[in-house]
């Protein structure tokens, strides 16, 4: 049987993903991070 129309059974929460690179001056390389909803996770 074909399914009757219903929405998906879960809510989609939209969050902003922000990639950033920070200059660390005299240190070697740079810090690269991923911010999700205001929290740095990587």
């Amino acid at each position: 049987d074909a399914e009757f129309r219903h929405d998906s059974g879960y809510e989609v929460h939209h969050q902003k993903l922000v990639f950033f690179a920070e200059d660390v001056g005299s240190n070697k390389g740079a810090i690269i991070g991923l911010m999700v909803g205001g929290v740095v996770i990587a």
């Epitope: 049987d1 074909a2 399914e3 009757f4 129309r5 219903h6 929405d7 998906s8």
Partner: antibody
Framework: QVTLKESGPALVKPTQTLTLTCTFS??????????VGWIRQPPGKALEWLAH???????SYNPSLKSRLTISKDTSKNQVVLTMTNMDPVDTATYYC???????????????WGQGTTVTVSS | DVVMTQSPLSLPVTPGEPASISCRSS???????????LEWYLQKPGQSPQLLIY???NRFSGVPDRFSGSGSGTDFTLKISRVEAEDVGVYYC?????????FGQGTKLEIK
């Protein structure tokens, strides 16, 4: 408040086409997720779902009656129309329209019903 | 089509006593979105059907808490903890997971 009311002929002859109108208030069929459907009930018998139309003009029909049914809407008039061709005495029933709205924050069930209109098919 | 089978078809109850109506579907009515679209409607004498329970166990607004719904898969139950005179009428289960939407035959609740 939400109200629905069915209208149409009380008596139709066999082979004729039945046209029923559901006029509603308290909601709009231009609202995302909104829909209106038709259900019928022969005298002393159980309920039978016929068709449903959604705000985006998507339609769903009972396969056993699909060849005879057409559902349409007039959003500006707050109306949904059901036509059923080739009427037969077994189509004698009370015909109801009911609202149903999709959405995670919606009931997603037939939460408001009209009072029903009785249609007799006889020559 | 999904066949909905209710039992009993007639249910005489003494006011204040509990009542239970069974509804079985011929196949699972679990929708692909994870929800089970099983509804209960009450048709009081001379009136249109009215929604009592949606998605198996959710009471519609204004429905007294003596009404409760439960079940999963193919086996569902409507319970009334203490029947009142105003509860008389025909109770229908309905599945809306699959086309066509289908109703049970109805259970007529009457007061003893």
């Amino acid at each position: 408040q939400v109200t629905l009311k069915e209208s149409g002929p009380a008596l139709v002859k066999p082979t004729q086409t039945l046209t029923l109108t559901c006029t509603f208030s308290g909601f709009s069929l231009s609202t995302s997720g909104m829909g209106v459907g038709w259900i019928r009930q022969p005298p002393g018998k159980a309920l039978e779902w016929l068709a449903h139309i959604w705000w985006d003009d998507d339609k769903s029909y009972n396969p056993s009656l699909k060849s005879r049914l057409t559902i349409s809407k007039d959003t500006s008039k707050n109306q949904v129309v059901l036509t059923m061709t080739n009427m037969d005495p077994v189509d004698t029933a009370t015909y109801y329209c009911a609202r149903r709205q999709l959405g995670l924050r919606s009931i997603d069930a037939m939460d408001y019903w009209g009072q029903g209109t009785t249609v007799t098919v006889s020559s | 089509d999904v066949v909905m089978t209710q039992s009993p078809l007639s249910l005489p109850v003494t006011p204040g006593e509990p009542a239970s109506i069974s509804c079985r579907s011929s196949q699972s009515i679990l929708h692909s979105n994870g929800n089970t679209y099983l509804e209960w409607y009450l048709q009081k004498p001379g009136q249109s059907p009215q929604l009592l329970i949606y998605k198996v166990s959710n009471r519609f607004s204004g429905v007294p808490d003596r009404f409760s719904g439960s079940g999963s898969g193919t086996d569902f139950t409507l319970k009334i903890s203490r029947v009142e005179a105003e509860d008389v009428g025909v109770y229908y289960c309905m599945q809306s997971s699959f086309v066509p939407l289908t109703f049970g035959q109805g259970t007529k609740l009457e007061i003893k």
